[in-house]
């Protein structure tokens, strides 16, 4: 009955503070409405990074001020998190909820450790 969610163990953010990873879920049923949430876990505290509800076959729509963007293809969601700094290094968990039709299913990934390295400032040029 449990829904399995797979995501990569480790991802390195780009020098521009952008990290992308795939979140794939094994849907036990034919869901038409899915909610995907990215959570950050640090010191056993969990916070929401971003969330989007989408209809199967349609694009993911995050809120305008969200740091996340994404696309969906079948049971795969391609997530991109932007604006990351070194202090944002941590475990990012993909949570998937099959909202409709019944039954409801919850899937929690093991998390992706995202490493963010702030770029070195450019040396002053004379």
């Amino acid at each position: 009955k449990a829904m399995h969610v797979a995501q990569p163990a480790v991802v390195l953010a780009s020098s521009r503070g952008i990290a992308s990873f795939v979140c794939e879920y094994a849907s036990p049923g034919k869901a038409t409405e899915v909610r995907v949430t990215v959570l950050r876990q640090a010191d056993s505290q969990v916070t929401e990074v971003c969330a989007a509800t989408y209809m199967m076959g349609n694009e993911l729509t995050f809120l305008d001020d969200s740091i996340c963007t994404g696309t969906s293809s079948g049971n795969q969601v391609n997530l991109t998190i932007q604006g990351l700094r070194a202090m944002d290094t941590g475990l990012y968990i993909c949570k998937v909820e099959l909202m409709y039709p019944p039954p409801y299913y919850l899937g929690i990934g093991n998390g992706t450790q995202i490493y963010v390295i702030d770029p070195e400032p450019c040396p002053d040029s004379d």
């Epitope: 009955k1 449990a2 036990p28 909610r35 949430t37 969990v46 949570k95 909202m99 299913y105 929690i108």
Partner: antibody, heavy 118, light 108 residues
Framework: QVQLVESGGGVVQPGRSLRLSCAAS????????MHWVRQAPGKGLEWVTF????????YYADSVKGRFTISRDNSKNTLYLQMNSLRAEDTAIYYC???????????WGQGTLVTVSS | EIVLTQSPGTLSLSPGERATLSCRAS???????LAWYQQKPGQAPRLLIY???SRATGIPDRFSGSGSGTDFTLTISRLEPEDFAVYYC?????????FGQGTKVEIK
Amino acid sequence: QVQLVESGGGVVQPGRSLRLSCAASGFTFSHYTMHWVRQAPGKGLEWVTFISYDGNNKYYADSVKGRFTISRDNSKNTLYLQMNSLRAEDTAIYYCARTGWLGPFDYWGQGTLVTVSS
Amino acid sequence: EIVLTQSPGTLSLSPGERATLSCRASQSVGSSYLAWYQQKPGQAPRLLIYGAFSRATGIPDRFSGSGSGTDFTLTISRLEPEDFAVYYCQQYGSSPWTFGQGTKVEIK
């Protein structure tokens, strides 16, 4: 701090209706799914109903399907339970509960007692 | 529907003793979706353990959870006076959300 406060319980005759409320504070209400759970006197916990973030998706236990309706007003940070055609077996303490980020019910209200009796 | 069966129904122990509570599911439950709650008389339930073995905020480390598949265990390593209560397991991986019938831990 997170707080859930239920109200609206009381004594009601079989066949009548009652509406429970759960006022939420200390968190962004619209970011969480919510539940009602009940406990008959001296008995265990029974899940009653669930509502999604925006209120569009609702699930019910078979024992209340067609009689109870869950709803929420995110602008008022309030969860509701409309109970119609009440039966003696609906007598219980009714708790509202928040779904934590990882799925368990991480915060509960203090409960409100509903007694269905003639 | 996933049926959860808890055993024993009542556990009579003395303070300082170890308590082992069992929860068995009628079908496989992912360990990410199994929780334990504590309830004292006149109070609402309180989340103790989620994801089968992660302690909720503020829960002392004498409480631990284990198990996978269909068999789960809550262990209280050394019972304190405030631990005497009723304990419920719950699965939250799919609807309908279900609870076990509870195990009462009472003072011997």
